[in-house]
């Protein structure tokens, strides 16, 4: 048995579990969700069981191999997967152990601004990014962007100082994970200094 | 083409009142923040007021503070500023100024005259 | 308040001719300075912003350096559109100041 394979897919989306086997002689395959049979297969009579009926339409073997590709993917199929190829030949059965982390594809994130201060024609404030819908491992990036200038910022939150008179700057969160990314509206810092409660166009 | 016309300007006596106003065309007038800055006989600039995009903030220099109010009416795309308590140093050519994305007073009307004497 | 400092007030130069204008700031301003140009009988208008940058449709000829609390104005070569007054702006802080102006005429 090799070491663990750690897999991503995507809500909606297709993962194969890849399977290479030098086993001359295969009496079954099983393959195992968090401990749950999942699929049994025995070559010698092209018998494929798929233990839940949910998982019918999910579960295909492309190329007429073993290994398996699971279709429309939901959240909760994250977890641990194992296959076992049991043989004759073999004295115990030929093992491998798989992670699979499903994630969503990303909303566009959301940006709230934090207690402003402006003194002297200086506004500062620091703009926090998140995900409405608490997604897990998700990174957060910001560009800002303008004539002053063209930097990036890493983390969900972001300081920002702006004078008046300055060149605008607009900023931009950008949310990833292994999926996917996305970008949230973009902020132009001459607006967001003015004060959201006045500003009917505010792009947060 | 971004245009200012400022307009109001008139001799006025000490501790008289006056209103200017500057009608604002060819630029998103209620994205930008707007200023009064005004130029005395001397040929000495001054910044007088400015006002923010939304009129939330606003802000002015101590020699005209609680006598001059910065104002503005994004719908008729106008800038206002009311003037009160007025001395003979205030006596000047007020020009109302605009910003772009770039840099504060890129755009400037071409002056009223204030004239505050006896 | 930010107190500018501009010089000279006053000065007559040559067409062809290098001509540098300074302006001193009270206390350090970083690089938030704006420089005017204002011909005879027109408004003023923006040649260099956040200290160097020229504006667009600004003739290369004239640039802006410094940060910090010294500022200059240069203008390589006079052309005779060039005279007028020239102005610097501080926006680092509120209240906003202008120096008091350098006339530049033609000798």
């Known amino acids: 048995s090799g070491p663990v394979k750690e897999l991503v897919g995507s809500v909606g989306g297709a993962v194969t579990f890849p399977l290479k086997s030098k086993v001359k002689q295969v009496d079954s395959i099983v393959w195992t969700f968090n401990t749950t049979p999942l699929v049994t297969i025995q070559p010698e009579g092209g018998t494929i069981i798929v233990t839940q009926n949910r998982n019918r339409e999910r579960v295909d073997f492309p190329d007429g191999g073993y290994s398996l590709k699971l279709s429309k993917l939901k959240k909760n199929d994250s977890g641990i997967y194992y296959v076992g190829i049991y043989s004759s030949s073999l004295q115990q059965p030929s093992t491998q152990e798989y992670v699979l982390h499903v994630y969503e594809h990303l909303s566009k994130p959301k940006v709230t601004m934090g207690l402003q201060s402006n003194k002297n024609g200086t506004c500062v404030t620091n703009l926090t990014c998140c995900m409405e819908h608490g997604e897990e491992d998700v990174i957060y990036t910001w560009k800002a962007l303008g004539q002053a200038a063209n930097e990036s910022h890493n983390g969900s939150i972001l300081p920002i100082s702006w004078r008046w008179g300055e060149s605008d700057m607009t900023f931009i969160c950008v949310a990833r994970n292994p999926v996917s990314r996305n970008f949230s509206s973009p902020i132009l810092a001459r607006k967001l200094c003015e004060g959201a409660a006045d500003d009917p166009d505010s792009s947060m | 083409e971004v245009k200012l016309v400022e307009s109001g300007g008139a001799l006025v006596k000490p501790g008289g009142s006056l209103k200017l106003a500057c009608a604002a065309s060819?630029?998103?007038?209620?994205?930008?923040?707007m200023s009064w800055v005004r130029q005395t006989p001397e040929k000495r600039l001054e910044w007088v007021a400015t006002?923010?995009?939304?009129?939330?903030?606003?802000y002015y220099p101590d020699s005209v503070r609680g006598r001059f109010t910065i104002s503005r009416d994004n719908a008729r795309n106008t800038l206002y500023l009311q003037m009160s308590s007025l001395r003979s140093e205030d006596t000047a050519l007020y020009y109302c100024?605009?910003?772009?994305?770039?840099?504060?007073?890129?755009?400037w009307g071409q002056g009223t005259l204030v004239t505050v004497s006896a | 308040d930010i107190k500018m400092t501009q010089s000279p007030s006053s000065m007559y130069a040559s067409l062809g001719e290098r001509v540098t204008i300074t302006c001193k700031a009270s206390?350090?301003?970083?690089?938030?300075l704006n420089w005017f140009q204002q011909r005879p009988g027109k408004s003023p208008k923006t040649l260099i912003y956040?200290?160097?940058r020229l504006v667009d449709g600004v003739p290369a000829r004239f640039s802006g350096s410094g940060s910090g609390q010294d500022f200059s104005l240069t203008i390589t070569s006079l052309e005779y559109e060039d005279m007028g007054i020239y102005y610097c702006?501080?926006?680092?802080?509120?209240?906003?100041?202008f120096g008091a102006g350098t006339k530049l005429e033609l000798k």
């Open positions: 702006l501080q926006f680092d802080e509120f209240p906003l100041t």
């Open positions: 206390q350090d301003i970083n690089i938030y």
């Open positions: 006002i923010s995009s939304g009129g939330r903030n606003t």
């Open positions: 956040r200290a160097n």
């Open positions: 060819g630029f998103a007038f209620s994205s930008y923040d």
């Open positions: 100024a605009t910003r772009n994305s770039n840099y504060a007073f890129a755009y």
